[in-house]
Interface confidence: low
């Protein structure tokens, strides 16, 4: 069965029917490149006007304007609210009523697009093994990012959150739109990792999402991570207004200024650091979403009301610190050099700011006590990679799954830590999953491109699948059409159960408490201690010929390394700058 | 500390129905699946299904369905087995059990209700 | 459903004796709990997830195995371990084993 011109409130739309085999019999419909919404720079996102006859969604269309990974040039364009959608087909009949699933890419708010990764045609965000394993529906989408996306003034001149708008508009274009494609309107599952999980959880927080989204799943990245929110957005805007030209004092000009800059210049205008600073690399994520009063009303800690009847998954890597230790303190993974207490003590008076002295101290003394039996460097180098993943996943993603569930009604709340170590050979022994590992495994590349992984591959990629998709399907990750290795129960505040993702899941990878004694000291003893400073009050932007970011080790198998200059092309982005 | 106190013992003719309770505390009612477990006299165990007091979500055992009915009442951290269409074999003990964690074996026991269905 | 067969039905032993009993299951599972139950008491868990104990749980009490073959061994019975033992599988249809009386010899 196919679908063929499928009518929505823009007009008709045409994709493709995919055989799944020479036999006939299954396939997959693939919509690419439909548009959701229009934008002018810097201004919220609108209804896109339409289309006269059948338009073919052939092709992806251009991610949003952003710096290539060598951040001395652009690419993709500003007219790029597009989404693509995969419809599974069985032999006889046109699927309906389908549980729907919304992909939001990461890259830091900074990079990325609704395809991902691709290295001859082979997209990171294919959602065609998850549609087509999980009998679900399948959507991804642009949404602008950098200065574009989260430039703010902190006032109503520039109220930021361009992007998380982005992201809504294309939500609500599904809820309205997805039935003529098959599938529910009333099971839509947001799903997102790293800046996308983030988005994932803003965007269940934002009562501009009432009633539209029934599920979510947060891979690595919560509002709540120390990286999502913006504290401090004029002192960035101020930043890129004085590199671009235009005026800084007064709110209102430099917006006004901002809006008629060429957007080029404006993406350019703005370098991630990436060789070693004063704090931690994600202090200087500066275009990111803000309190804005409106789309984000409060502090995202005091709006998990609104997420009463959203079940949801959440969950990080085991080692989702690795890729910003090895940036922090560069030795993390070189074997003949050496992490030192003065370096790892630097990187956590970086993380603990606020709460001065007594912050770093107490912080340093309950991550370093294992080094009194073990002062080898390969404890010492875990320990780094430990307190930047507990810092900026597993303590926001801990407080969030508590939140979450003391707040649900009707919602369900699981919880896993994904640990199926990183393929990368140049990596140390000891290493475990680095960030925006998971990804390959979500959307089935072990068997999109089997030459390139192993069985034990392909077993994490089937349950993740499975448990994704049925969690779509019924709230349950266990309850759907995919059996599953093990049974997942949800995560409840007195034993924090999770899943342990690995490729043997059995009875005991259900595990609780994770990393007890450490929440325990981020929730209540660092809690307590006086705050001394706000988080950014001191941060000063790196130098204008500090060294922009190399391209960070890959998944080999998904990215070539240098990404063309091009713009006609679709440039490679590598899967590990999930962020 | 966790506590299941069950209702008292029942004697029902053939074809009547029971109901039995088993009231919570110690913990918070809505984050533990309860299930019931009946022993006939001198028998094993045998499950008979679960509800998620959260959601009044319920799964009853093959042999059951259509015969039993679970229901909770989460003001009073109550929950409730009604069985229907009662034969002797349904003489046994029910017991309440709540969930524990991790594989989520039966961690919490009821003292248990013993149920005579006699004519 | 999956059936659950424990071996042996009874067992006679003296204090101090090492035990095993053993529950076979009909397809492969992914997860087995042991329970002892005492005349005129509710079951109590013992070991869940194959080999974990709960707290509370004397430690010469311990569980093995995995697929369809697995094991509980008290390693030193005492006196307050004669009861019936019984395993069970946890799927959506739970099962439990027929049970194991573990007797004074």
């Known amino acids: 069965a196919k679908l063929g011109a499928v009518y929505t409130e823009g007009g008709f739309v045409e994709g493709v029917n995919k055989k799944l085999s020479l036999l006939g019999g299954d396939s997959v419909d693939i919509f690419k490149g439909i548009p959701f919404a229009t934008a002018k720079t810097l201004e919220n996102p609108q209804r896109h006007p339409g289309w006269q006859g059948t338009l073919k969604a052939t092709n992806f269309k251009k991610r949003c304007l952003q710096a290539t990974i060598t951040q001395d040039n652009t690419y993709g364009q500003e007219d790029c609210l597009y989404l693509n959608i995969w419809v599974p087909q069985g032999r006889k009949q046109v699927s309906h009523n389908l549980p729907v699933m919304v992909w939001i890419y990461g890259g830091a708010f900074l990079m990325g697009s609704g395809q991902g990764a691709n290295f001859l045609k082979n997209y990171l965000y294919d959602g065609e093994e998850i549609a087509t394993r999980g009998n679900v529906i399948v959507v991804t989408f642009n949404y602008r990012v950098g200065p574009l996306g989260f430039l703010s003034t902190g006032d109503a001149n520039l109220p930021g959150n361009f992007g998380l708008r982005d992201q809504h508009m294309a939500i609500a274009w599904v809820k309205r739109n997805i039935a003529a494609f098959g599938g529910d309107p009333d099971n839509i599952t947001i799903f997102g990792e790293s800046a996308g999980a983030a988005s994932v959880s803003l965007q269940t927080l934002s009562p501009y999402n009432k009633g539209l989204i029934r599920r979510a799943i947060s891979q690595s990245g919560m509002a709540l991570s120390p990286w999502a929110i913006q504290k401090n957005p004029l002192f960035w805007a101020k930043t890129i207004a004085k590199k671009v030209g235009c005026p800084t004092e007064d709110t209102g000009k430099m917006a006004a200024c901002l809006k008629i800059t060429d957007p080029r210049a404006l993406t350019l205008a703005y370098k991630l650091p990436v060789k070693k600073q004063e704090y931690p690399v994600v202090h200087y994520l500066a275009f990111i979403p803000v309190i804005d009063g409106d789309f984000i009303p409060d502090d995202p800690i005091n709006l998990y009301n609104n997420t009463a009847d959203i079940d949801y998954i959440a969950g990080i890597n085991n080692m989702d610190g690795h890729l910003f230790a090895t940036i922090d303190v560069p030795a993390v993974d070189k074997t003949k050099q050496t992490v030192t207490e003065e370096d790892f003590y630097r990187l956590v008076s970086g993380h603990t700011v606020a709460k001065g002295l007594k912050g770093a101290q107490a912080t340093f003394d309950i991550y370093t006590e294992s080094w009194a039996q073990d002062p080898s460097q390969e404890n010492m180098k875990k320990t780094v990679v430990a307190f930047e993943t507990d810092v900026l996943f597993l303590i926001p993603t801990e407080i969030a799954l508590a939140q979450h569930k003391a707040h649900a009604k009707s919602a369900k709340t699981y919880s896993y830590l994904f640990s199926h170590p990183s393929r990368m050979p140049i990596y140390p022994k000891w290493m475990g999953a680095d960030h925006a590992d998971d990804l390959q495994y979500v959307f089935g590349k072990p068997f999109a491109t089997p030459l390139g992984y192993r069985p034990q591959d392909r077993a994490v990629s089937k349950a993740m699948i499975a448990y994704w998709t049925n969690f779509a399907r019924s709230g349950d990750p266990n309850m759907g059409n995919s059996p599953v290795p093990t049974h997942w129960y949800p995560y409840t505040l007195e034993n924090g159960n999770y899943l342990d993702i690995t490729k043997t899941i059995t009875s005991a990878s259900m595990k609780e408490h994770l990393r007890e004694k450490f929440l325990k000291f981020w929730a209540v003893t660092f809690e307590v201690l006086p705050t001394v400073t706000g988080d950014q009050d001191t941060l000063t932007p790196p130098e204008d010929d500090s060294e922009v970011a190399p391209d960070p080790p890959s998944d080999d198998s998904q990215v070539v390394p240098v990404p063309p200059t091009d713009d006609s092309v679709e440039a490679q982005m590598p899967a590990t700058i999930g962020f | 500390q966790v506590q299941l106190v069950q209702s008292g013992a029942e004697v029902k003719k053939p074809g009547a129905s029971v109901k039995v309770s088993c009231k919570a505390s110690g913990y918070t009612f809505t984050s533990y699946n309860m299930h019931w477990v009946r022993q006939a006299p001198g028998q094993g165990l045998e499950w008979i299904g679960v509800?998620?007091?959260?959601?009044?979500?319920?799964s009853y055992a093959q042999k059951f369905q259509g015969r039993v009915t679970m229901t909770r009442d989460t003001s009073t951290s109550t929950v409730y087995m009604e069985l229907s269409s009662l034969r002797s074999e349904d003489t046994a003990v029910y017991y309440c059990?709540?969930?524990?964690?991790?594989?989520?074996?039966?961690?919490?026991w009821g003292q248990g209700t013993l149920v005579t269905v006699s004519s | 459903d999956i059936q659950m067969t424990q071996s042996p039905s009874s067992l006679s032993a003296s204090v101090g004796d090492r035990v095993t009993i053993t529950c076979r299951a009909s397809?492969?599972?992914?997860?087995l709990n042991w329970y002892q139950q005492k005349p005129g008491k509710a079951p109590k868990l013992l070991i869940y997830?194959?080999?974990r104990l709960p707290s509370g749980v004397p430690s010469r009490f311990s569980g093995s195995g995995s697929g369809t073959d697995f094991t509980l061994t008290i390693s030193s019975l005492q006196p307050e371990d004669f009861a019936t033992y019984y395993c069970?599988?946890?799927?959506?249809?739970?099962?439990f084993g027929q049970g194991t009386k573990l007797e004074i010899k």
């Open positions: 059990a709540r969930d524990y964690y991790g594989s989520s074996p039966l961690g919490y």
């Open positions: 069970q599988q946890r799927s959506s249809s739970p099962t």
């Open positions: 397809s492969s599972i992914s997860y």
């Open positions: 509800i998620n007091p959260s959601d009044g979500a319920t």
């Open positions: 997830a194959a080999s």
